[in-house]
Structures are given as C-alpha cells and as structure tokens.
C-alpha cells in the first residue's frame, strides 16, 4: 500500500497503525495516501521537525501512550487537512509555541493525561476551527486570561483532573458555543461571579470533586440551556436561594458529598425536566414542606447518608412522578402517616439504617405501586396490621436487623410474610429479639403455641383490611424478583472520544440499572 513500514499495519482504507516498544522514532516511509495514522504504545520520546511531511492528506493523527516528552515546533507542518490530533497519555510537560500553526482544519485536540504545567494564549491562537479541546489529567495550576479567546467555535472543553486553584471570571468569556465544560477534580475553592455568563449554550458543567465552599447567587443565571450540573464532592454548606432559579432545561443535578445542612423551600426550581437529584452524604437534618415542589418530573431522589431526623408531612409535595426515594442511613425515629401520600408512582423506597421505632398503619396507603421496601436495621418491634395488604406489586421487602417482639401481636406480620413469600425474594429472614425465650429464632418459624400473649392493646388498623394476596388472575402465585441493587453516584465518568462509559459503584441506593439512567 504505497510502502508500509515494517513496524506498522496498513489497511486498504488508508489507515496506518504503528504499535510496539521497539519503535523509537516515527516509522518511515509512511504511505503518502494515509488518512489515519495511529502511533500507540511505543518508546518514541520526541517528535522532530516535519516527520509527517509526505502525508499531507492525513485527517486523524493519534500519538498516544508513548514516552513522548519533547516536540519540535514544526512537527506538524504540512498537515493542513488534519481534523483530529491526539497526544494523550504521553509525558509532555511543555508545548512549544506555534506547534499547532497551520493546522487550519483541526477540530479535535486531545492533550489529556500528560504533565503539562501551563498553557498560554499563543498555544491555541491559530486553532480557530477547534471544536473539542481535552486538557484533563495534567498539572495545570492556572489558566491565563485569553487562553481560549480565539476558540470561538469550541463546543467541548475538559480541564478536569488538574491542579487549578482558581479561575479567572474572564477565561471563558468568548466561548459562546461551548456545550460541555468540565472542571472536575481540581482544587477550586470558589467560582467568581460572572465566570459562566458568556456560556449561553452550555449544556453540561462538571464541577465535582473540588473544594468549592460557596456558590455565588447568580452563578448560573445565564446558562439557560444547562442540562447537567455536577456539584458533588465539594464543600458547599449552603445554597443561595436563587442559585438554581434560571435552569429550566436541567435534567441532572448532583450535590452529594457536600456539607449542606438545610434545604429551603423553592431552592430547586422551577426545573420541569429534572429527573434525578442526588443529595446523599450531606449534613441535612430536616426536610421542610414543599422543598421539592417545583420538581414535577423528578423520578429519583437520593437523600441517604444525611442526618435527617424530621420530615415535614408536605416535604414531598409535588413529586407525583417519583419512582425511587432513598432515605436510608439517616436519624429518622418517626414518620408522619401522610408523608408519602403524594408519591403515587413510587416503586422503591429505602428506609434502612435509621432509628424507626414504629410506622403508621397508613404510611404506604396511597403508594400502591411499591415494588421494594427496605426497612432493615431500624428499631421496629412490630408493624401495624394491614400495612402491606394493598401492595400487590411488592416483590422485595427487607425487615431483618430489627428488634422484633415475637409475642402474639407478631402473628399478623408472621402470617403475611409466610403467605406472601413467593413475592418477597430470598433475603435474610427477620429474627425475634424478644421475649428472651424466642430470641434469635426466625420470626416465621416461631412456635405460635408458645408465643407470649401481648401485654398491650393490639393496634387497630388505620384503614380497612384488604386481601394482601388476592385470589385473582392478576396476581400470580410467584413473581419474578427484580432484586434492587445499590447505586453510589450518578454517571460522571468521562471518556473523551465517542462514548461515555457507565462505571457505577452501587452502594448507596437500591435501584435497577434500567431505572438508574
């Protein structure tokens, strides 16, 4: 194929790939008609003047995962057709000025995972057609004003995983076409007011894993097209009342891993497209009425691993589309009987690892579609008669690690568990804690003839008893169990070529993969 170097493979489609540790310089002669060249996993340490001079038709050049630490300014001369250039995963500490001069067609420039210490305005001043610039995984400590001023067509800029401690409010001011800005995993402590004002087309802003303590009230007021806002794992202790007021397109907001102590009513809104709200690992102690009332389309609400001890009866007003509610690992002792009444579409609720001592008989009265309830590791001694009777879709109920009191009052719960076992999976069985003669015995095989009589008046059901397992064709004898798994964080894992990889560690919220988005 017009002379293919022995160290490379060349395909009919004008694609050349050169790989291997034995390669220490750009192989020659490269076929003059090559349109794509990949130099991967070699021991090349430098690029000299014009190694690609004779392949002027080149459109894509990937020089990745090498030992490359030095590049001559004229290394890419004569590549006027080049649209895609990747120098990712090398050992570059400095970029020569003028390195990208003449690359008039360049649209994607990947410089990620190197050791770059600084960038200057002159580096990219010739790249007026650039749409994508990847600088994540370097050692950048600051971005000088004007660094991106000539990149007016840029749509994607990744500055994540650097050492940025502050951002100038002017650095992004000319990037009116930018759609994705990633600043995750830096050392930012605050973002100056006006920093994002010029980003009127921004759709994704990733600020997670910084040290941001305060958000300016109007920080996002010009970003009306923002769809994904990642603020997790920072030091945010409070949210200014109007900070999220101008984000009508937002469909994903992550705030987990911060220091939020309270949420004021109306803080989230109006966000008609928000589907998921992640608030776990904060210091929230209570939820007031109507705190989420603007989130009419919310489907996933994660409030686990906080310090919530009080939920106002109207806290979840407006969440008529909610499917998943995670309240586990908080300090709840009691719940109002009406607190979930508005959640008509709720499917999964996790209440484990709290201090719940009892549940009102009507707690799930209007939540007829519940499929999974997690109540393990609370202080429950019994449950009200009929509490689950109307839940025809329930297929996972976790009750273990509670101090069940196995007197005669436990019989309705024991019977319900026994008669409904085909629908409830094979999780750990609840065990009696008292009285002493049955401690440690499985609640569902205690000898009912020696069960201690109750010493208190049995609780009257709060609503009429209905068959918990009605004899109708719509309720089969066995139900396939879709065991809920646990999800730690929303997808914020980026790969910067073509796809976003989903890599979740599922330990915070019980949810199916399909439902987790």
């Amino acid at each position: 194929y017009h002379g293919c170097p022995s160290e490379c493979t060349c395909s009919r489609a004008s694609q050349v790939e050169c790989t291997g540790a034995r390669i220490v310089a750009v192989p020659t002669p490269l076929p003059w008609n090559a349109m794509s060249l990949q130099i991967l996993n070699t021991h090349i340490t430098e690029l000299n003047e014009s190694p690609f001079l004779n392949i002027s038709a080149l459109i894509a050049l990937r020089i990745e995962k090498n030992e490359l630490s030095r590049i001559t300014p004229g290394a890419f001369r004569n590549l006027g057709s080049l649209r895609y250039l990747s120098l990712a995963n090398n050992k570059l500490q400095v970029l020569p000025i003028g390195l990208f001069q003449g690359l008039d067609s360049l649209e994607s420039l990947l410089l990620s995972s190197n050791q770059l210490l600084q960038i200057q305005p002159a580096h990219f001043s010739q790249c007026s057609n650039l749409k994508e610039l990847q600088l994540h995984g370097n050692h950048l400590e600051y971005i000088p004003d004007g660094a991106f001023d000539h990149l007016v067509g840029l749509t994607k800029l990744n500055l994540g995983k650097n050492s940025l401690t502050h951002i100038s409010p002017r650095v992004f001011q000319h990037l009116g076409n930018l759609q994705v800005l990633r600043l995750y995993e830096n050392r930012l402590t605050d973002i100056p007011m006006g920093t994002f004002d010029g980003l009127v087309n921004l759709q994704e802003l990733a600020l997670q894993q910084n040290q941001i303590g305060l958000l300016s009230p109007g920080l996002f007021h010009n970003n009306h097209n923002l769809q994904r806002l990642y603020l997790s794992n920072n030091h945010i202790s409070q949210l200014p009342p109007s900070v999220f007021m101008q984000l009508p397109q937002l469909n994903r907001l992550t705030l987990f891993g911060n220091s939020l102590k309270e949420l004021s009513p109306g803080i989230f809104g109006p966000m008609p497209n928000l589907r998921e709200l992640w608030l776990y690992d904060n210091h929230i102690s209570s939820l007031p009425d109507n705190v989420f009332s603007n989130l009419r389309q919310l489907q996933v609400l994660i409030l686990s691993r906080n310090q919530i001890s009080f939920i106002s009866p109207g806290a979840f007003n407006g969440l008529t589309e909610l499917r998943e509610l995670s309240l586990h690992t908080n300090a709840l002792q009691d719940l109002d009987g009406n607190v979930f009444r508005m959640l008509a579409n709720l499917q999964n609720i996790s209440l484990q690892n709290n201090r719940l001592r009892q549940l009102p008989g009507n707690i799930f009265a209007n939540v007829n579609g519940l499929m999974a309830i997690q109540l393990q590791n609370n202080q429950l001694e019994n449950l009200p008669l009929g509490i689950f009777d109307h839940l025809g879709k329930l297929c996972e109920l976790r009750l273990y690690d509670n101090p069940w009191r196995c007197d005669s009052d436990i019989l309705p719960l024991r019977n319900w568990l026994l008669l409904n076992q085909p629908r409830l999976g094979t999780d750990t069985v609840p065990v009696c804690f008292s009285p002493a003669n049955v401690r440690g015995q499985s609640l569902i095989i205690i000898n009912v003839n020696v069960a201690v009589p109750s010493v208190h008046v049995p609780e009257v059901p709060s609503y009429p008893e209905t068959p918990w397992y009605p004899d109708t064709p719509s309720y089969p004898d066995t139900t396939s169990v879709s065991s809920t798994t646990e999800l730690t964080s929303p997808v914020e894992d980026y790969t910067d070529l073509t796809t976003i990889q989903v890599t979740d560690d599922r330990s915070v919220w019980g949810m199916t993969q399909a439902q987790s988005g």
Partner: antibody, heavy 113, light 111 residues
Framework: QVQLVQSGAEVKKPGASVKVSCKAS????????IHWVRQAPGQGLEWMGY??????KYNERFRGRVTMTRDTSTSTVYMELSSLRSEDTAVYYC????????WGQGTLVTVSS | DIVMTQSPDSLAVSLGERATINCRAS??????????MNWYQQKPGQPPKLLIY???NQGSGVPDRFSGSGSGTDFTLTISSLQAEDVAVYYC?????????FGGGTKVEIK
Amino acid sequence: QVQLVQSGAEVKKPGASVKVSCKASGYTFTSFVIHWVRQAPGQGLEWMGYIYNDGTKYNERFRGRVTMTRDTSTSTVYMELSSLRSEDTAVYYCARDYYFDYWGQGTLVTVSS
Amino acid sequence: DIVMTQSPDSLAVSLGERATINCRASESVDYYGISFMNWYQQKPGQPPKLLIYAASNQGSGVPDRFSGSGSGTDFTLTISSLQAEDVAVYYCQQSKEVPYTFGGGTKVEIK
C-alpha cells in the same frame, strides 16, 4: 385449648353443593390462617385453599367451584363446594395456621346418585 | 406445581429400631434460608397431626424421637426408636408455594 370442630357428615347428589363449617375456639380466631384439605377414601391428602382476614387463596383445581368464607362473630369458617361429582366423595378437614398445626375431626361428604 | 415423592410406600420396622422416611420435591422448597417442608402423622380414623415443620422444627407435644432433616429438594423424617403407637401413615408436605402439595404417604408398621 385449641379446638376445631367441624359440621356433620353430608350426603349429596351430583351437581349439588355442600357447605362444611369449622368452628374455632381456644385462640384468637383472626390471628390465624384456616386451610381446607380433603382426603378421598384410601387416598392421600389434597390442599384446597385457605382463608385469612377475608383474603382467600384457592388451589387451581377447585377454582370456580370452591368458596371459603368466615364469620368472626362466631369464629367459624365455611367451605362450600359446588357442582359436586362422585370423585368429590372425601373427608374434608379444616386445619389451623400456615403449618397446619391443629386439625378438625373431618367431615365425610358422600356424593352419590 | 411442586410434586412431592415419598419413599418407601410402606415400611416395616421392629420395635425400638430406627425408621427413616424420605421425601423428594420436584424443585427446591427453600426460602429465606428456610426449608418449607412439613411432616404429618395420620392414624386410622383420625385427622393428620403435625410432627415437624420447616424441615426440622418439632410441633407442640411431639416426642423427641421424631426428627426431620434436609434442605432444598431432599428431606428425611426419622423415628429414632419405633414405638407401637407410631404405627400410622406419614405424609410430607411443601408449603413454599401455592398449591401446597403432599407426598403420597408412607405406611409404617411393626415388623
């Protein structure tokens, strides 16, 4: 002590219905399931269904022919079997709890023309 | 439906000797780590009596010579020292899922 006392023997013609009662005493009536099991002469045991808190679950083999009801005021459970045929001749038992820990003495139902 | 198969159909054992009855389910009767297998004794002209529930738990007033074991699909009822009053038909039953089904019975007699 726990007791389940059933109604007396019945002789029925094919196509008729029979209603057998089971009166419970010695325990909290509403706290336990009542099952019905039948045993044809010289044969094994066959579960028919249960009733608990007005919820019922029937063996598909009897669906449409069996109805179980209860009267909490008298702590009595009833099992009615309709469209009787000769192969329904059997002793019918009520039994308490999920694990069938106490049984009635049985009611012989004979279906014969 | 889960089919319960008992063996043997009948068993003759000398007084004081061990009697063993087996029961196999067509699928596992385990749930929650518990085997929902029960054993009943029926003497002529009497209703059945609960001996063992959940595979190995003795019913109220059942003599210690009766014990149950097994898990999954294979279960055993053992009478450690047969007494004259143990002459009866013994049934296994699964209560894992509806319809609850019984084995065909094993008749135990004195040799």
